[in-house]
């Protein structure tokens, strides 16, 4: 008996050949001996199966001898041996129909697990196989699962269903929602404008929620709502802003969010939340600001930074052209009786500057200027 | 012999209706699922709907699903097509085509086609 | 959707010559192909379906082949008659799509 394997929803084309290459008659039948369809000459009759209105056949074919069953819509239930009668023989086809469907919504928050379940007629053992997108297999019976979705998650999962050593394929598209970026750091001299991008890492047609970003600044003892926000069908609306600072942020997607100037009292790390309509669970997204001053009071040259700075970040203070006069892995150095020239106060990575501030130091009888 | 005649083309404007009709004779019409195939100017041919034998099913593409409707009506021999919300990407000759019998089956006849044009 | 790349999308020939139009699936179409012959202000006129089977009264110098992705229709001595736009149609799944033409003209 031949096996056919069939998806739910799918259509299936099941065949059925005569010896003589010419149009004669013809019947499916279920395993219960009642008709699904044949033909009277050349036309198609249909019997009072249930399939009735999904199956059919390709009468462009009977002349050639070849008498298909196609049923489409398919359902599990339609699992079934299919007999052919022509020619006084019969065929049997037996048809296996599987489903495959994702436990809850395809749209699922980072962390959060994905089930996906595999429907299956009654007296089949199937196994089932399942490659995600960053090529992570999983093996499983009638249940498969994913705890703690990763952003690479995302995409189209492969699902090959093994009965009879026959094999059908699923394609499931997963899209894990959750910012690009899990954490970002934005480095600003003192004064300068400030500019926060929170974009995220899917897109769907349309985008329902509310957010806000707590600001926990590191000369704080606790931390502060900067902003609150909805978020309409792609189109943000300011809810709530605070005074000081007074954020600014923009009306279309991605997030973004203005500081007209960074300040060493807001120097420190902001949580940006977004809930989104009939979701359970929160998308983050951590910012830092690291903010830095170079000044000259008196005989004191003095370069500080303020926020989340790695221990192993570096600060100097150099005359430019020349070697760094102080460097130490701390968040403050100076110079005592600086000479003068253009002096420049760096914050570094393993030699890669991330911050530069410069400040102009006159001869002793004037005033330093900041450039 | 097989004859399909189409009428009811015309100018129409943007978001207007037209309803196109296809007359069969030579072959007994109610055994036959039936389609419209059109082929805008310098285009290639686009199946656009079918119907079966008795109407008991249609098929649309997404390209016109919502705003076209086949129909057919076996006593007159007759196959429709109704357009709504008409664009200007559907200004095309529309043809009225027999399925060689079910709707799996390719076309075998086809009418000379009607003209659609689709303009403000 | 499946999509049918047809190809040449225009060729020049002369009589007695013998002419090959190819059509490619996106996917296996399981020989659910057909051959369509168009003349300017009339309907296309079908030659050739299920890959290899020749319509009654088409001329036998018109043959198909192929499987899975790839088709071929082929004149074998080109006639007079036989200047026009042939088209492929994939019919495997209810949404039938076509090539998209290739014109034989004369040279």
């Known amino acids: 008996k031949k096996v056919v394997l069939g998806k739910k929803g799918d259509t299936v084309e099941l065949t059925c050949t005569a010896s003589q290459k010419k149009s004669i008659q013809f019947h499916w039948k279920n395993s219960n001996q009642i008709k699904i369809l044949g033909n009277q000459g050349s036309f198609l009759t249909k019997g009072p199966s249930k399939l009735n209105d999904r199956a059919d056949s390709r009468r462009s074919l009977w002349d050639q001898g070849n008498f298909p069953l196609i049923i489409k819509n398919l359902k599990i239930e339609d699992s079934d041996t299919y007999i052919c009668e022509v020619e006084d023989q019969k065929e049997e086809v037996q048809l296996l129909v599987f489903g495959l469907t994702a436990n809850s919504d395809t749209h699922l928050l980072q962390g959060q697990s994905l089930t996906l379940t595999l429907e299956s007629p009654p007296g089949s053992s199937p196994s089932v196989q399942c490659r995600s997108p960053r090529g992570k297999n999983i093996q499983g019976g009638k249940t498969l699962s994913v705890s703690q979705l990763e952003l690479q998650d995302s995409g189209t999962w492969t699902c090959t269903v093994l009965q009879n050593q026959k094999k059908v394929e699923f394609k499931i598209d997963i899209v894990v929602l959750a910012f690009q970026k899990a954490s970002s750091i934005v480095y600003k001299k003192e004064g300068e404008q400030v500019e926060f991008s929170f974009p995220l890492a899917f897109t769907v047609e349309k985008l329902t929620g509310s957010g806000e970003l707590w600001w926990q600044a590191e000369r704080a003892s606790s931390s502060k709502s900067w902003i609150t926000f909805d978020l309409k069908n792609k189109e943000v609306s300011v809810k709530r802003v605070t005074q000081d600072p007074k954020l600014q942020m923009g009306k279309k997607l991605p997030l973004h969010l203005t500081l007209p100037q960074a300040l060493p009292q807001y120097a420190g790390s902001g949580n940006l939340t977004l809930a989104l309509e009939a979701k359970t669970g929160k998308l983050h997204q951590e910012v830092n600001l690291v903010v830095m001053r170079a000044t000259q009071l008196q005989k004191n040259l003095t370069c500080e930074v303020w926020g989340p700075t790695s221990p192993k970040l570096m600060l100097s203070l150099k005359l430019e052209n020349k070697e760094a006069k102080v460097s130490k892995r701390e968040k403050a150095v100076w110079v005592l009786n600086p000479e003068a020239g253009m002096w420049q106060c760096l914050l570094s990575d393993s030699g890669q500057v991330l911050l530069e501030s410069n400040i102009k130091v006159l001869p002793t009888w004037s005033t330093p200027v900041q450039p | 012999e097989v004859q399909l005649v189409e009428s009811g083309g015309g100018l129409v404007q943007p978001g207007g209706s037209l309803r196109l009709s296809c007359a069969a004779s030579?072959?007994?019409?109610?055994?036959?699922?039936m389609s419209w195939v059109r082929q805008a100017p310098g285009k290639r041919l686009e199946w656009v709907s079918a119907?079966?034998?008795?109407?008991?099913?249609?098929y649309y593409p997404d390209s016109v699903k919502g705003r076209f409707t086949i129909s057919r009506d076996n006593a007159k021999n007759t196959l429709y097509l109704q357009m709504n919300s008409l664009r200007a990407e559907d200004t095309a000759v529309y043809y009225c085509a027999r399925k060689y019998g079910g709707a799996y089956d390719p076309f075998d006849y086809w009418g000379q086609g009607t003209l659609v044009t689709v303009s403000s | 959707d499946i999509q049918m790349t047809q190809s040449p999308s225009s060729l020049s020939a002369s009589v007695g010559d013998r002419v090959t139009i190819t059509c490619q699936a996106s996917q296996d179409i399981n020989n659910y192909i057909a051959w369509y012959q168009h003349k300017p202000g009339k309907g296309p006129k079908l030659l050739i379906h299920y890959t290899s089977t020749l319509q009654p009264g088409i001329p036998s110098r018109f043959s198909g082949s192929g499987s899975g992705r790839d088709y071929t229709l082929t004149i074998s001595s080109l006639q007079p008659e036989d200047f026009a736009t042939y088209y492929c149609?994939?019919?495997?799944?209810?949404?039938?799509?076509f090539g998209g033409g290739t014109k034989v003209e004369i040279k």
């Open positions: 119907i079966s034998d008795h109407s008991t099913n249609t």
């Open positions: 030579g072959f007994t019409f109610s055994n036959y699922a």
């Open positions: 149609l994939q019919y495997d799944n209810l949404l039938f799509t």
